[in-house]
C-alpha cells in the first residue's frame, strides 16, 4: 500500500466577503487511522480552524459526510468570510495515538478575500472660503481587499488632477484603506457645484462607488451692494434702496445708518434666488427730508455670514427742491463699495421682493 498523501488541489482560492469559502482536501489512503485537522498558517503559532476529532467550530462544515465508510474527502466550507480570514490553510492528517500525532500535511491553499470598499466619505474644509481661493477636500474609504484600487476626483463631471492619494498599510494586510486629498479652486458660480470622489475596485464589478460634497457647504460668495435714490414717494420723502446682489449663503443682516446713526436693522428673509444659486435682496429706506436741515449721508451696511460688515453710502442733499430729487442726478451719489467688488446689473434676477 502506498503511503498516504494529503492533496490540496487548489493553490489559491478567492472569495468575496460574506460568502462561504470551500477549501478542498482529500487523502489517498485510509491508513493510518486518525483525524484530519485544518490550520491557518504554519508553525507553532498556527491557528486551528477545524478538528475532526473534537471541538466546536460554528463557521465550519464538512463538505462530505466524514463519518461515512471509505470517506477520503475532508474538504471544508467556512461561512461568512471576512478579510480577517485571509491566509494559507493547511489540511493535516493525524495518526491515532495518545495523543494523536501529526502525520502529513497538505501543501496549503491560500485564501484571499475580496472585500468591497466602504462608501467613500468626502469632507471639505471646516470654514467657508470665497471665490478664487483654493480649498482641500478629503476622501476616505476603508476595508477593501485586494489592495489595488483606483480613485478619481471630479468637479461637476470634470476630472480633477490636483490630488494626492495614499493606500494603507503599505505592506501585506487583511484589508486596506485609501485616503486622498484634492485641491479645488472656487469660482463665484460654484454654489450648485459638486465635488465627487469615485472609487473603482475589482469587487464592484465596474460600478464605482461615489462620495460627494456640495460646494454650497464650502463656498461663501460675498454680496455686491448698490445704493440708489428712487423718485419721490410723497412730499418731503425720498426713497433710497440698497440692492444686495449675488451673495451666498443666505445669512445676511442689513443696517441703515443716517449720518452714522442706526436707523433700522433687518435680516434677509424673502430673497430672490439666481440661477447660479446665489441670492439677491433689496431693502429700502424712506427718508423724511424735511426733518433734516443739512445733507444726509445714508449708509447701507451689510454683515454677511458672520463676516466683517461691508457698506455703501449715498449722500442726500437736502438743499435741493424735493421734486427734483426724483431723478438719480438730483442728489449726488458718492457711494463706494468698500469691498472693492464691481457693481453690475444682474440679468439673472427671477423676481424682486421689496421690503419696507
Amino acid at each position: 500500500e502506498e503511503e498516504l498523501q494529503v492533496i490540496q488541489p487548489d493553490k489559491s482560492v478567492s472569495v468575496a466577503a460574506g460568502e462561504s469559502a470551500i477549501l478542498h482536501c482529500t487523502v489517498t489512503s485510509l491508513i493510518p487511522v486518525g483525524p484530519i485537522q485544518w490550520f491557518r498558517g504554519a508553525g507553532p503559532a498556527r491557528e486551528l480552524i477545524y478538528n475532526q476529532k473534537e471541538g466546536h467550530f460554528p463557521r465550519v462544515t464538512t463538505v462530505s459526510e466524514s463519518t461515512k465508510r471509505e470517506n477520503m474527502d475532508f474538504s471544508i466550507s467556512i461561512s461568512n468570510i471576512t478579510p480577517a480570514d485571509a491566509g494559507t490553510y493547511y489540511c493535516v492528517k493525524f495518526r491515532k495515538g495518545s495523543p494523536d500525532t501529526e502525520f502529513k500535511s497538505g501543501a496549503g491553499t491560500e485564501l484571499s478575500v475580496r472585500a468591497k470598499p466602504s462608501a467613500p466619505v468626502v469632507s471639505g474644509p471646516a470654514a467657508r472660503a470665497t471665490p478664487q481661493h483654493t480649498v482641500s477636500f478629503t476622501c476616505e474609504s476603508h476595508g477593501f481587499s485586494p489592495r489595488d484600487i483606483t480613485l478619481k476626483w471630479f468637479k461637476n463631471g470634470n476630472e480633477l488632477s490636483d490630488f494626492q492619494t495614499n493606500v494603507d498599510p503599505v505592506g501585506e494586510s487583511v484589508s486596506y484603506s485609501i485616503h486622498s486629498t484634492a485641491k479645488v479652486v472656487l469660482t463665484r458660480e460654484d454654489v450648485h457645484s459638486q465635488v465627487i470622489c469615485e472609487v473603482a475596485h475589482v469587487t464592484l464589478q465596474g460600478d464605482p462607488l461615489r462620495g460627494t460634497a456640495n460646494l454650497s457647504e464650502t463656498i461663501r460668495v460675498p454680496p455686491t451692494l448698490e445704493v440708489t435714490q428712487q423718485p419721490v414717494r410723497a412730499e418731503n420723502q425720498v426713497n433710497v434702496t440698497c440692492q444686495v446682489r449675488k451673495f451666498y449663503p443666505q445669512r445676511l443682516q442689513l443696517t441703515w445708518l443716517e449720518n452714522g446713526n442706526v436707523s433700522r436693522t433687518e435680516t434677509a428673509s424673502t430673497v430672490t434666488e439666481n440661477k447660479d444659486g446665489t441670492y439677491n435682496w433689496m431693502s429700502w429706506l424712506l427718508v423724511n427730508v424735511s426733518a433734516h436741515r443739512d445733507d444726509v449721508k445714508l449708509t447701507c451696511q451689510v454683515e454677511h455670514d458672520g463676516q466683517p460688515a461691508v457698506s455703501k453710502s449715498h449722500d442726500l442733499k437736502v438743499s435741493a427742491h424735493p421734486k427734483e430729487q426724483g431723478s438719480n442726478t438730483a442728489a449726488e451719489n458718492t457711494g463706494s463699495n468698500e469691498r472693492g467688488s464691481s457693481d453690475y446689473k444682474d440679468d439673472d434676477d427671477k423676481h424682486h421682493h421689496h421690503h419696507h
Partner: antibody, heavy 119, light 110 residues
Amino acid sequence: QVQLVQSGAEVKKPGASVKVSCKASGYTFTNYWINWVRQAPGQGLEWIAMIDPSDSETHYNQIFKDRATLTTDTSTSTAYMELRSLRSDDTAVYYCAMDYGSLYAMDYWGRGTLVTVSS
Amino acid sequence: DIVLTQSPDSLAVSLGERATINCRASQSVRSSGYNWIFWYQQKPGQPPKLLIYLASNRDSGVPDRFSGSGSGTDFTLTISSLQAEDVAVYYCQHSRELPTFGQGTKLEIK
C-alpha cells in the same frame, strides 16, 4: 482522551426490556460511529449494531434487528442500546465501542455493562 | 453473510517463541484495495483492544512484535516473540459487509 462510560449492571426478568447507556467524552460525538457488541459468559464477541450519531443512520445484525434499538442524545453525547423481549441467553456483558476511522471497526471500548436475565 | 473461522481454538506457546493465529473468511474481504480485517486482544475482565486494522496495520501503542498479514480470505496474526502479558483471547473481525467476529483463539504460555 476518548472515554466511553457505560451505565451500571442490570438484572432483568425474561420478557422485560433493558436500556444500556454509553456516555462519550474526549471527542466530537457526532463525528464517529458507535458500535454495540456483546459477550456471553465464557463466549466470544457478537456484534449487535452500529449508529452514526450525526444522522442516526443505523445498521443492525439481522439476529437483533427486531429486538434491539439504537438511539443517541447528541446534547449529552450519549448512546443508548435497548434490547426487548429478554431471554436468559441474553445474559452478557454489553459493550459500546467507538469507530475512530469509519472502517466499521472498534477503536475505543467502554468497560461493559453486565445484563443478567433471570427469573 | 461472511463467516470468519479462526484456528486453532487455543494455542500454547513458550515465552519468546512465535505464536501464529489464523483467520479464514468464507468469501473475500478485499474491497477498494483494502483487506477489511481487524485483530483484537482481550484479557480476562477487560474489554477487547484493537491490535491490527485493515489486515496489516498496527494500531497506535501496539508493540511491534505483533504483525498482521494475508489477503482475500486468509489472514494471520503473528506474535514474533511471546511475552507473558500476551496471554489473552484473540479475535479477528471483518467489515467487508456488516461486522462479524471470529470465534476467538485462546493463547496460553506453554
